[in-house]
């Protein structure tokens, strides 16, 4: 079985987390998908989900979270705009497939939001506009209330150092490769 892995992102307040969750399009293209936060020792909590069935490239906004599902490409795009320090935590994408348990997608995202000036390499330091202008056609979707207890058999690790990965340790704060994380205020 594939081991659970994490990618760690360190962003500043006010910035946007912009990630993608990868799925098998033949199996899950129109399945309902959700973005969850996993708090230590608790059941995953669903923060936002796509419609049921999931609509192709149709943005769904719940508060500061925008989901966009690209069926042809097997990708769910997740944006969390105007990040706050309290948003720090471990997140995951899941696919709802009732009556079966939700199917977890890899990788989990370890988000660390810190206070301070958000101008970093890869960001546009002069930009004050919210570059994620959400079209008025966005929809709020109703998410299923159930959450799989099997996804919380143990508290998730507190840092990427505890995570077993298939190849090399993934921690965006200590890799030698150049990492381009698009960061827009």
């Amino acid at each position: 079985a594939t081991k659970l892995t994490e990618e760690k992102y360190e962003l500043k307040e006010g910035q946007t987390l912009d990630v993608k969750c990868d799925y098998t399009l033949e199996k899950f293209a129109s399945s309902q998908k959700a973005w969850q936060i996993i708090r230590d020792g608790e059941m995953p909590k669903t923060l936002a989900c796509t419609e049921r069935p999931s609509k192709n490239s149709h943005p769904v906004q719940v508060g500061r979270i925008i989901l966009e599902d690209y069926h042809d490409h097997g990708l769910l795009r997740v944006r969390m705009v105007n990040l706050q320090v309290e948003d720090s935590g471990l997140y995951q994408c899941v696919i709802y497939q009732p009556p079966k348990e939700p199917h977890m997608l890899f990788d989990r995202i370890r988000l660390v939001v810190t206070k301070g000036f958000s101008g970093t390499p890869g960001s546009n330091e002069n930009s004050t506009q919210n570059v994620y202008k959400i079209p008025p056609t966005t929809t709020k979707a109703l998410c299923p209330l159930y959450t799989s207890p099997r996804t919380v058999t143990q508290a998730p690790p507190k840092s990427t150092a505890d995570v077993s990965t298939p190849d090399s340790e993934i921690n965006l704060t200590n890799v030698t490769d150049i990492i381009r994380v698009p960061v827009f205020n």
């Epitope: 990618e7 912009d18 690209y70 490409h73 890899f106 570059v131 190849d167 827009f184």
Partner: antibody
Framework: QVQLVQSGAEVKKPGASVKVSCKAS????????INWVRQATGQGLEWMGR????????GYVQNFRGRVTMTRDTSISTAYMELSSLRSEDTAVYYC???????????????WGQGTLVTVSS | DIQMTQSPSSLSASVGDRVTITCQAS??????LNWYQQKPGKAPKLLIY???NLETGVPSRFSGSGSGTDFTFTISSLQPEDIATYNC?????????FGGGTKVEIK
């Protein structure tokens, strides 16, 4: 250093299939998407789709759905793009390109293969 | 799909000239725009990512700006080795799309 090395030129007959390989080195193969882009002679660049080497999941542009398959062999850090039911309009140079990390919404192609010319002719 | 319109399609300038290429998106793409240089018979090379960020090792005479739908790529002082075709590419929405390219020649 990061390198993507593609297989050599191919000449195919209409209706046949072609499989182009792209061997990656100098980085962790499973951490970055592999994308495929083609360019017909004198024409612009056309994105065909992407593959996540970690999961093996792939997605294709509508124009190519049903004809293209992107796969990988992680043991040799190699990605493959197979295009079937070839027609003369598929004559082009096919490039593999490294995209962003598998979990970031980033399609910045920072490293490219040298290109593989596929000629479709009867 | 998002259309990317590049202009001009070709231009001729003298060594040392300032060269400007524009790329217009058919809808708002935020700052999700990259610029590539392609020399004849070679693969494209990334010059600028996310509208204005210079790729490592790329000379500082290359720059980019813009936001939303209108983007500009500039070579502040054209050099003989800059003879190439330049392409913009958006990634705000899938499918990814490229501009038609701008061929830069020396007068």
């Amino acid at each position: 250093q990061v390198q993507l090395v593609q297989s050599g030129a191919e000449v195919k007959k209409p209706g046949a299939s072609v499989k182009v390989s792209c061997k990656a080195s100098g980085y962790t193969f499973t951490s970055y998407d592999i994308n495929w882009v083609r360019q017909a002679t004198g024409q612009g660049l056309e994105w065909m789709g992407r593959m996540n080497p970690k999961s093996g999941n792939a997605g294709y542009v509508q124009n190519f759905r049903g004809r293209v398959t992107m796969t990988r062999d992680t043991s040799i850090s190699t990605a493959y793009m197979e295009l079937s039911s070839l027609r003369s309009e598929d004559t082009a140079v096919y490039y593999c390109a490294r995209g962003g990390r598998t979990s970031i919404w980033s399609f910045v192609f920072d490293y490219w293969g040298q290109g593989t010319l596929v000629t479709v002719s009867s | 799909d998002i259309q990317m319109t590049q202009s001009p399609s070709s231009l001729s300038a003298s060594v040392g000239d300032r060269v400007t290429i524009t790329c217009q998106a058919s809808q708002d793409i935020s700052k999700h725009l990259n610029w590539y240089q392609q020399k004849p018979g070679k693969a494209p090379k990334l010059l600028i990512y996310d509208t204005s960020n210079l790729e490592t090792g790329v000379p500082s005479r290359f720059s980019g700006s813009g936001s939303g739908t209108d983007f500009t790529f500039t070579i502040s002082s054209l050099q003989p080795e800059d003879i190439a075709t330049y392409n913009c590419q958006q990634y705000d929405k899938l499918p990814l799309t490229f501009g038609g390219g701008t061929k830069v020649e020396i007068k």
